[in-house]
């Protein structure tokens, strides 16, 4: 015989769930024991069956889960999974916060990405800081020339996608350019999008030729002579 224990504690590390109103929330407390334990749920310390909740709840005992769809502010609270068998019991608390802020287009920090000058062969980092209520996705784009033109017949620029990423709100997204060459010079755009819309800002990368060691003032002349 064995008291209940968590089988996937790493899946339970996210204690605070802050989600926009209208989204679906799923709490899981995967467990095992001998005899096989049962699971029940409490909300703010009281037995929770979801009978007073519009849309009810879904309890999936085989998945050790509680699912609530279309959450509203009244769903805020502490949700406790209580797992027990004849030998013992364990519990875990989840905190649910329902966000009512108006989700907006992503906001990009002013001045990022910043115009940058680099020397051939050096490494460059372009930064983009995104603020977004809804989960944002980011693309780094390079403006390119096709058949001698920067713009298509529709009047919009030709762009090449360098990197795509889904990020958490308020993260800094970095585009790394290693060992830059003259061809890397040009306009780069950080484009952030969410379910409301897109926002984007651009910067120019200027790439200078490698410094000629024979005329670098700071270097001792003798080092570069044959």
């Amino acid at each position: 015989q064995q008291a209940p224990y968590w089988t996937h504690p790493q899946r339970m590390e996210k204690k605070l769930h802050a989600v926009p109103a209208g989204n679906t929330v799923k709490f899981r407390c995967p467990a095992a024991g001998n005899p096989t334990p049962t699971i029940r749920w409490l909300k703010d310390g009281q037995a929770f069956h979801g009978e007073n909740r519009i849309g009810g709840i879904r309890l999936r005992h085989q998945h050790w889960s509680l699912v609530m769809e279309s959450v509203v502010p009244s769903d805020r609270g502490t949700y406790t999974c209580l797992v027990e068998n004849a030998v013992g019991s364990i519990r875990y608390n989840y905190l649910l916060d329902v966000l009512e802020r108006s989700p907006h287009r992503p906001i990009l920090q002013a001045g990022l990405p910043a115009n940058t000058t680099a020397v051939v062969g050096s490494d460059v980092e372009l930064l983009c800081k995104v603020y977004s209520d809804a989960q944002p996705h980011i693309q780094w784009l390079k403006h390119i020339v096709i058949n001698g033109s920067s713009f298509g017949a529709d009047g919009f620029p030709y762009v090449q996608v360098l990197k795509t990423a889904d990020i958490n709100s308020s993260e800094v997204e970095v585009l790394y350019l290693r060992n830059v060459s003259a061809e890397d010079a040009g306009e780069y755009t950080c484009l952030a999008g969410n379910s409301i819309g897109l926002s984007y800002q651009s910067a120019w990368l200027t790439v200078l030729p490698e410094e000629d060691p024979t005329w670098t003032a700071a270097a001792p002349e003798a080092r570069y002579t044959d």
Partner: antibody, heavy 124, light 112 residues
Framework: EVQLLESGGGVVQPGRSLRLSCAAS????????MHWVRQAPGKGLEWVAV????????YYADSVKGRFTISRDNSKNTLSLQMNSLRVEDTAIYYC?????????????????WGQGTMVTVSS | DIVMTQTPLSLSVTPGQPASISCTSS???????????VYWYVQKSGQPPQLLIY???NRFSGVPDRFSGSGSRTDFTLKISRVEAEDVGVYYC?????????FGGGTKVEIK
């Protein structure tokens, strides 16, 4: 040709449910957020809900929060609106609207393509 | 929520004459990326709305150049330089900066 075609409207009693669908064609559906907008007879336009391109984010107007659920099936290029606990004031034409895409916008970033709409009448 | 207020409620215009519709938002629609997210639509009888102007002043593809949008931050204008018979319908402004997306109440344009 880019097209959105709504279906599922009809006459329903207050308190009952209805499920609307929107079939998308002519564009990469899975790369776009999608919206529902409604228009009561003889009235203006009211935004209802939005879902992100991958379905991970959903937002609703206060008037439908907790009663309506927006969802999508990218494998079938279909957007849905499950409407529960319907009220007389939900009577409207419901339009499916394309939202923002994932790439550099060659034009507006959404709200450019609307379906023809499907009529929902809630009446006892 | 951002409130969009449109004036006038209706407009009767002689063909060939100009027409102007105003829209005021309760908050600035100028975004951090420098764009102003106001859209203009026309809805003709029995049809869904059709996009005319996006991001304050950009004409949507296929929209005649007699339509123009202007304004800044909270005050916006849609102008039709020379009204034609086919321009009859209800015109709406919309803010596309945050949810809930909101529309003006509409301006009905008819021909004298």
């Amino acid at each position: 040709e880019v097209q959105l075609l709504e279906s599922g409207g009809g006459v329903v009693q207050p308190g009952r449910s209805l499920r609307l669908s929107c079939a998308a064609s002519g564009f990469t559906f899975s790369s776009y957020a999608m919206h529902w907008v409604r228009q009561a007879p003889g009235k203006g336009l009211e935004w209802v809900a939005v879902i992100s391109y991958d379905g991970s984010n959903k937002y609703y107007a206060d008037s439908v929060k907790g009663r309506f659920t927006i969802s999508r099936d990218n494998s079938k290029n279909t957007l849905s609106l499950q409407m529960n606990s319907l009220r007389v004031e939900d009577t409207a034409i419901y339009y499916c609207v394309r939202g923002a895409g994932r790439g550099y916008p060659h034009g507006p970033d959404g709200f450019d393509i609307w379906g023809q709409g499907t009529m929902v009448t809630v009446s006892s | 929520d951002i409130v969009m207020t449109q004036t006038p409620l209706s407009l009767s215009v002689t063909p060939g004459q100009p027409a102007s519709i105003s829209c005021t938002s309760s908050r600035s629609l100028l975004h951090s990326d420098g764009k102003t997210y106001v859209y203009w639509y026309v809805q003709k009888s029995g049809q869904p709305p059709q996009l005319l102007i996006y991001e304050l002043s950009n004409r949507f593809s296929g929209v005649p150049d007699r339509f123009s949008g202007s304004g800044s931050r909270t005050d916006f204008t849609l102008k039709i330089s020379r009204v034609e018979a086919e321009d009859v319908g209800v015109y709406y402004c919309m803010q596309y900066i945050e949810a809930p997306l909101t529309f003006g109440g509409g301006t009905k344009v008819e021909i004298k």
